[in-house]
Interface confidence: low
């Protein structure tokens, strides 16, 4: 059976296509090619008489066609208008005709696409952004890339318009991109230049650094404020509610106790119209903000009841501190047998009784801090009473 084959089937615009003929019958008088799916004299491209080896152009000949003795037809410099069906009519010597129809598709070489956006400065959690891949062309596949990766599955990402439009619902600050679109058809492919989004957001709640609360008199107070924001936030400082200055950093040299108070950082984003504040308490004091853990020692840890006495000592290197004592979570002294001396550093128990056995610890403190020692265990023994007969046990 007479058949035709297009080589290639998908042709790039400006290239050439060869309509090959298979199973050509013997004893031929000639053949003709027609544009379309049927024989139509008005749409004849070329006729060929085998006897004279003469090719005769028809009404549909564009000058780009070449017919070969084997009936194949070459069309050069194809255009999209050449897309479609082509019919070969073979005239046999017995004047009985045979026909075969083939087709091919011409696609344009795709241009470099570009991305248009309906909003290049969206506001976080408020605006949606629609990207459109230009130009719109027929028989084209559209693909999108974010951060050089294919689109993640996300309810906030929607494709429409034959994948030509990518919509970001409720943008976040992480949606800056870059975004690229790729267009493809069977004969070519091209990708756009990257496009980035300028997402407006913030300010977030500001952070004041450093985190220190306590400062000694004479030190320099240097505070810095930062809030994530686009465009960058504008900052101002208030001390005890009174405006000080519009800067990101606050510097006060040689502070005194009078500089204690509430320090407020105010961050403002003029585009989003949002404000955020953070308050930090600063305490200027001679006292140590961190009291070291005291050490507790006992003159003995095992004593004889009603006979021995014991001294417990609480040691610390800190100055300006006070000391208190605890026994079984009770504050001491709790009886006349217990005495505190040397600024409460020493607890004396004289004499020790059975009820004094247990855990003791001391605590050192100042108005702004405190710390307590590890506990120490006091054991109280009693000598065995003599037997009624005066004999020792044994």
């Amino acid at each position: 059976q007479l058949t035709t084959e297009s080589m290639p089937f998908n042709v790039a615009e400006g290239k050439e296509v060869l309509l090959l003929v298979h199973n050509l019958p013997q004893q031929l008088f000639g053949y003709s090619w027609y544009k379309g799916e049927r024989v139509d004299g008005n749409r004849q491209i070329v006729g060929y008489a085998i006897g004279t080896q003469q090719a005769t152009p028809g009404p549909a000949n564009s000058g780009r066609e070449t017919i070969y003795p084997n009936a194949s037809l070459l069309i050069q410099n194809v255009t999209q208008n050449d897309t479609g069906f082509y019919t070969l009519q073979v005239i046999k010597s017995d004047l009985v005709n045979e026909e075969a129809t083939g087709q091919f598709h011409v696609y344009p070489e795709l241009p470099k696409p570009s991305i248009s956006s309906n909003n290049s400065n969206p506001v976080e959690d408020k605006d949606a952004v629609a990207f459109t891949c230009e130009p719109e062309t027929q028989d084209t596949t559209y693909l999108w890339w974010i951060n050089n990766q294919s689109l993640p599955v996300s309810p906030r990402l929607q494709l429409s318009n034959g994948n030509r439009t990518l919509t970001l619902l409720s943008v976040t600050r992480n949606d800056t991109g870059p975004y690229e679109c790729e267009i493809q058809n069977p004969v070519s492919a091209n990708r756009s230049d990257p496009v980035t989004l300028n997402v407006t957001y913030g300010p977030d709640t500001p952070t004041i650094s450093p985190s220190d609360t306590y400062y000694r008199p004479g030190a320099n107070l240097s505070l810095s404020c930062y809030a994530a924001s686009n465009p960058p936030a504008q900052y101002s400082w208030l001390i005890n509610g009174t405006f000080q200055q519009s800067t990101q950093e606050l510097f006060i040299p040689n502070i005194t106790v009078n500089n204690s108070g509430s320090y407020t950082c105010h961050a403002n984003n003029s585009v989003t119209g949002c404000n955020r504040t953070t308050v930090k308490t600063i305490i200027v004091t001679e006292l140590s903000p961190v009291v070291a853990k005291p050490q507790i020692k006992a003159s003995k840890t095992t004593v004889t009841g009603d006979k021995d006495s014991v001294n417990l000592t609480c040691s610390t290197n800190d100055t300006g501190i006070s000391i208190r004592w605890f026994f079984k979570n009770q504050s001491l002294p709790s009886s006349e047998r217990m005495k505190l001396s040397q600024g409460n550093t020493t607890l004396s128990i004289n004499p020790v009784k059975r009820e004094d056995a247990g855990t003791y610890w001391c605590e050192v403190f100042n108005p702004i801090s405190k710390n307590q020692s590890d506990p120490i265990m006091l054991n109280v023994n009693y000598n065995a009473l003599p037997q009624e007969n005066g004999l020792s046990p044994g």
Epitope: S150, P152, E182, A189, N190, R191, P194
Partner: antibody, heavy 127, light 110 residues
Framework: EVQLLESGGGLVQPGGSLRLSCAAS????????MSWVRQAPGKGLEWVSW????????YYADSVKGRFTISRDNSKNTLYLQMNSLRAEDTAVYYC????????????????????WGQGTLVTVSS | QSVLTQPPSASGTPGQRVTISCSGS????????VTWYQQLPGTAPKLLIY???HRPSGVPDRFSGSKSGTSASLAISGLRSEDEADYYC???????????FGGGTKLTVL
């Protein structure tokens, strides 16, 4: 017609060296990123190395890093794979492959897949 | 052990629909396009599906690709004897800085 033709395979002893070539025709070689992929007898495909269209960016599989070197000569339309310190486990058919999209269209083309492959060249490492 | 996981074999009778799965992670399939390759016996691999689901010209529409999360699949409908081949999935892996293949699936047409 777009074609890739590998050569340079053969029998080599463990520890030896071999240089594979891949001659490209039918397309603008200098516009495409290229890869080497190998297939051990009866096994699956294993990506070996990738080189950008101009040779400025290169990646290797961990299994060949430090032993194999990929390069290209765009003036000769040829891709190369220099293989040193060969081991028995390097025995395979080595294919060169062309990236699907031209670099002019792509910023990170290694995500696009390989659309044209050579017929392969067999490398046998044995004593 | 391949980075992408495929079943070693699959089979079907002529005219049937067969699906081959490919499982990966967020560093490869989850964040990149998947490509499928067909390797007929004794020949070099051939590009079958690119960008998760797109067919190059010349590949019959009986072949289709899809992806969900970190898994991809290749479906072949109207199975034919000439479809008997090895099928491989592939993707770029950002954490490995390299291209990774599945172990391959041998499709038998019964």
């Amino acid at each position: 017609e777009v074609q890739l033709l590998e050569s340079g395979g053969g029998l080599v002893q463990p520890g030896g060296s071999l240089r594979l070539s891949c001659a490209a025709s039918g397309f603008t070689f200098s516009g495409y990123d290229m890869s080497w992929v190998r297939q051990a007898p009866g096994k699956g495909l294993e990506w070996v190395s990738w080189i950008s269209y101009g040779g400025g960016s290169i990646y290797y599989a961990d299994s060949v890093k430090g032993r194999f070197t990929i390069s290209r000569d765009n003036s000769k339309n040829t891709l190369y794979l220099q293989m040193n310190s060969l081991r028995a486990e390097d025995t395979a058919v080595y294919y060169c492959a062309k990236d699907r999209l031209p670099q002019k269209a792509v910023r990170h083309s290694y995500a696009n897949g390989m659309d044209v492959w050579g017929q392969g060249t067999l490398v046998t490492v044995s004593s | 052990q391949s980075v992408l996981t495929q079943p070693p074999s699959a089979s079907g009778t002529p005219g049937q629909r067969v699906t081959i799965s490919c499982s990966g992670s967020s560093s490869n399939i989850g964040n990149n396009y998947v490509t499928w390759y067909q390797q007929l016996p004794g020949t070099a691999p051939k590009l079958l599906i690119y960008a998760d689901s797109h067919r190059p010209s010349g590949v019959p529409d009986r072949f289709s690709g899809s992806k969900s999360g970190t898994s991809a699949s290749l479906a072949i409908s109207g199975l034919r004897s000439e479809d008997e081949a090895d099928y491989y999935c592939g993707a770029w892996d950002y954490s490995l800085s390299g291209y990774v293949f599945g172990g391959g699936t041998k499709l038998t047409v019964l």
